[in-house]
Interface confidence: low
């Protein structure tokens, strides 16, 4: 339904508080380097303008699209060219090209300082002094570092952030109350950002059809009692929501997400028996809860899939009549029967089925040709099962840190051209699959592990896309969304790689390592490990283990010394010499 003024429509639907928060997120995700105060000023100007349009929808400029209004506002920033360089050229374009241009300049790895957490008392004072500014700053800092963060979900995080400070700043032990909550929000926030980044990559790099296929599979697993048509409706609506958010249309996205949650709750009897609790919550919690809801129980006595998709004489007729609908039904029927499969595996099976029908429906005897199609699924199912079994065994044997190290070595040997910080970040996250998924029973391991790995490998893909250095990474990232993980798994040691020159500076450490948290210390050691492999890609596990054990002993020894700095300088030289000898450098 058309509205005279889109900005007035969204302001009324969302309310002033959410409107302002979403505009701030949108601006911070576009202009990631702009100071907080500049963004607040822009948001206030847009909000005041929106209010004039609510009062009179026929007022001047109220009929303009949100892209036009927001783009015009962003293009008023005086330092655009100095701060953003060629991004300023976007302002010479007309909509919709201007918005597309802004989107292309979003930076997944912006050059921003790490967020340092102040002392608890300092944070509580800031919270009490000006709660509104404190919370806006949270939105701004997260949004500019995560330019694809799912905006309506960020509102939910901000609500929890506020609740944590409200509760803990009046607690007897503020730190004991607040810090675990902030840690949890940080970790959940990073995971949420990475999951959304995959959705946007799926839409932007592989198209709407790829996203819809993913959504059909996931929603069919989650809502196995829902009809195919009901799932199709949810998929269409969900695709619209994510297309909007990934496209920077955050007001429309938040509004449509609220409508979708409303629809789901009004129709929960035909969707899932697990939605009752979610639907009793307020809007932001409700939407989050629905997105995370557990799979409903499978209907009893579901008939064999073979009848409709292999044995029926109408397979090719039904396929020809409506290819995507028929494949969608196949995916729906397979997924609702297999909550134990990863979404990407289900998509591989559907792709295999599609390829078989394309070939067989043009054959002399189609049925004879596709009769054994389900046999082709067996190796596709067994590959991730075996891989997860082997890696969970390795994880249980090594523990998380050493398992991460094994992956660091494995991936550095596969793609040694990738930057060390990226290899460390990605391998650490890959290694977290162990503690995240290996504790699950068999039936939940694969969806947990392989779908999580898809999210992590997408991080590698988007970081690598910014500065491509490896054809192998480009190939695995761009050829097939659902085969990214098998593609990376299949990579062997890169024999074409010329080892990096040895640089003693890379392996020089100082006393500041002693004051780092355990996590930061691990990262330092893992950075050194990646550099070692880049210098000596053919080093054996045993050689690398020996050097890393020596390194750990060296850090422990010097951190206990009276004169730490002298210890690091003198013992460090010995360690470098010993390591060079051990690795034959």
């Amino acid at each position: 339904d058309a509205h005279k003024s889109e900005v007035a429509h969204r302001f009324k639907d969302l309310g002033e508080e959410n409107f302002k928060a979403l505009v701030l997120i949108a601006f911070a995700q576009y202009l990631q380097q702009c100071p907080f105060e500049d963004h607040v000023k822009l948001v206030n100007e847009v909000t005041e303008f929106a209010k004039t349009c609510v009062a009179d929808e026929s007022a001047e400029n109220c009929d303009k699209s949100l892209h036009t209004l927001f783009g015009d506002k962003l293009c008023t920033v005086a330092t655009l060219r100095e701060t953003y360089g060629e991004m300023a050229d976007c302002c010479a374009k007309q909509e919709p090209e201007r918005n597309e241009c802004f989107l292309q300049h979003k930076d997944d790895n912006p050059n921003l300082p790490r967020l340092v957490r102040p002392e608890v008392d300092v944070m509580c004072t800031a919270f009490h002094d000006n709660e509104e500014t404190f919370l806006k700053k949270y939105l701004y800092e997260i949004a500019r570092r995560h330019p694809y963060f799912y905006a309506p979900e960020l509102l939910f995080f901000a609500k929890r952030y506020k609740a944590a400070f409200t509760e803990c700043c009046q607690a007897a032990d503020k730190a004991a109350c607040l810090l675990p909550k902030l840690d949890e929000l940080r970790d959940e926030g990073k995971a949420s950002s990475a999951k959304q980044r995959l959705k946007c990559a799926s839409l932007q790099k592989f198209g709407e059809r790829a996203f819809k296929a993913w959504a059909v599979a996931r929603l069919s697993q989650r809502f196995p009692k829902a009809e195919f048509a009901e799932v199709s409706k949810l998929v269409t609506d969900l695709t619209k929501v994510h297309t909007e958010c990934c496209h920077g249309d955050l007001l429309e996205c938040a509004d449509d997400r609220a409508d979708l949650a409303k629809y789901i709750c009004e129709n929960q009897d035909s969707i899932s028996s697990k939605l009752k609790e979610c639907c009793e919550k307020p809007l932001l919690e409700k939407s989050h809860c629905i997105a995370e809801v557990e799979n409903d129980e499978m209907p009893a006595d579901l008939p064999s899939l073979a009848a409709d998709f292999v044995e029926s004489k109408d397979v090719c007729k039904n396929y020809a009549e409506a290819k995507d609908v028929f494949l969608g039904m196949f995916l729906y029927e397979y997924a609702r029967r297999h909550p134990d499969y990863s979404v990407v595996l289900l998509l591989r099976l559907a792709k295999t089925y599609e390829t078989t029908l394309e070939k067989c429906c043009a054959a002399a005897d189609p049925h004879e040709c596709y009769a054994k199609v389900f046999d082709e699924f067996k190796p596709l199912v067994e590959e991730p099962q075996n891989l997860i079994k082997q890696n969970c065994e390795l994880f249980e044997q090594l523990g998380e840190y050493k398992f991460q190290n094994a992956l660091l070595v494995r991936y550095t040997k596969k793609v040694p051209q990738v930057s060390t910080p990226t290899l460390v970040e990605v391998s650490r996250n890959l290694g977290k699959v162990g503690s995240k998924c290996c504790k699950h029973p068999e039936a939940k391991r694969m969806p947990c592990a392989e779908d999580y790995l898809s999210v992590v490998l997408n991080q590698l893909c988007v970081l690598h896309e910014k500065t491509p250095v490896s054809d192998r990474v480009t190939k695995c990232c761009t050829e097939s969304l659902v085969n990214r993980r098998p593609c990376f798994s299949a990579l062997e040691v890169d024999e074409t790689y010329v080892p990096k020159e040895f640089n003693a500076e890379t392996f020089t450490f100082h006393a500041d390592i002693c004051t780092l948290s355990e996590k930061e210390r691990q990262i330092k050691k893992q950075t050194a490990l990646v550099e070692l492999v880049k210098h000596k890609p053919k080093a054996t596990k045993e050689q690398l283990k020996a050097v890393m054990d020596d390194f750990a002993a060296f850090v422990e020894k010097c951190c206990k010394a009276d004169d730490k700095e002298t210890c690091f300088a003198e013992e460090g030289k010995k360690l470098v010499a010993a390591s060079q000898a051990a690795l034959g450098l």
Partner: nanobody, 124 residues
């Protein structure tokens, strides 16, 4: 084009039961909601109840809740309306309809295909 044929109507006493059937000429590939409507003499056609094609979910108008039950038999491409504790005010021509959309449809406009109807008369 999907053809819908109702059967099972007739004359019964108040308090009796009756089962109506609606058979589709073919399994409607994109049709997932089947509905029953009725038109009493001199009144508008009104929604009675609906069911998803697989039979997992069914919904009813308040006046028939607890008395009428809709079920389906996929193998026979048939949907049934079991009417118990019939009342004189249930007298009407009962129509079967099929919708190619989704949701708990209750309005005539939401349905794409219609049967010719079958007469049900409940005498007191």
């Amino acid at each position: 084009e999907v053809q819908l044929v109702e059967s099972g109507g007739g004359l019964v006493q108040a308090g009796d039961s009756l089962r109506l059937s609606c058979t589709a000429s073919e399994r409607p590939f994109s049709t997932y909601v089947m509905g029953w409507f009725r038109r009493a003499p001199g009144k508008e056609r009104e929604f009675v109840g609906g069911i998803t094609w697989s039979g997992i979910n069914a919904w009813y108008t308040d006046s028939v809740l607890g008395r009428f039950t809709i079920s389906s038999d996929n193998a026979k491409n048939t949907v049934y309306l079991q009417m118990n504790s019939l009342k004189p005010e249930d007298t009407a021509v009962y129509y079967c309809a099929a919708a190619s959309g989704v949701g708990r449809y209750r309005y005539e406009l939401q349905y794409d295909y219609w049967g010719q109807g079958t007469q049900v008369t409940v005498s007191s």
